[in-house]
Amino acid sequence: CDLPQTHSLGNRRALILLAQMGRISPFSCLKDRHDFGLPQEEFDGNQFQKTQAISVLHEMIQQTFNLFSTEDSSAAWEQRLLEKFSTELYQQLNNLEACVIQEVGMEETPLMNEDSILAVRKYFQRITLYLTEKKYSPCAWEVVRAEIMRSLSFSTNLQKRLRRKD
């Protein structure tokens, strides 16, 4: 399927909303920064079949949606922006699911790249563990917000590469 331009725009909108969600100065949180080990190689569009790449994108956005759908997240962010952000992610998930259904019959490769999906899940587990260890402090959420912006940027770039492949 043609990963629509609207999907990339949706990702950009999600990034802008996430940028607006900042509540405290990130410069007060420099000591809290953490290397979560973003699995950058999973966003290299060249190594995957298209369906596999879409499944990685879907997992990334699903995990982001899950992270920001928790009670702890609701307490951390301004409700209106959080709802807009979640809606944007939900719309992207729907787009990707429609894409996967369309693609399945067109490729003989397996639908899922299990190693890549697992790498993404472990990445989000590290983020959740960090938040737990930091007791969901404002600085911990600020660090995670920056990290999710980074991961969404990577997924935007993967989408661009997939579109160029078409």
Partner: antibody, heavy 120, light 111 residues
Amino acid sequence: QVQLQESGTVLARPGASVKMSCKASGYSFTTYWMHWVKQRPGQGLEWIGVIYPGNGDTTYNQKFKDKAKLTAVTSANTAYMELSSLTNEDSAVYFCTRNYKYDYYTMDYWGQGTTVTVSS
Amino acid sequence: DIVLTQSPASLAVSLGQRATISCRASKSVSTSGHSYMHWYQQKPGQTPKLLIYLASNLESGVPARFSGSGSGTDFTLNIHPVEEEDAATYYCQHSGELPFTFGSGTKLEIK
């Protein structure tokens, strides 16, 4: 493509104030921090401070907190820096630079620089 | 403030050889897996250009002959093989804590 266009050369008297501008294009101005950096002739680089145009949040190098004031006008996609109580020490090239990689705080795109000369 | 000491202040390297520039921080700039040290190149009359971020990550579009290493307080920029166009002043910059500071620069001349 990303561009940062700074105002031209400024000649000012000691004790005066100057306000320089940095017009951004090619990216979402409100969602990137903007740093300001000073470079004296033949010398190194000094970090002055940073502004988030989206909400006007600023953080300064303590050394410059009484010298520089950072502002931004989102409707014009422009960041500003005002320097007050000028002395010869303020004669330098001033760069605006876009923050890069979120909380890594590196600088990817740089304006061409505004040259400030303080002379009586 | 964290002081970044670059050495040497200047060096001359023959075409095709290796240039090694050191940057020592007065305090560690590494935390939880990342080293917040970055390298820039500035040619005469030009603006600085980001080469390396987080000590060892090559910025997009920068030739692979540039590499960075180090952690804690000691960092190195290597250029190999050196080319004519690499004649410039190189600065390290940390973002470990406020205020961010730059090294005093190392001027590279190509012989």
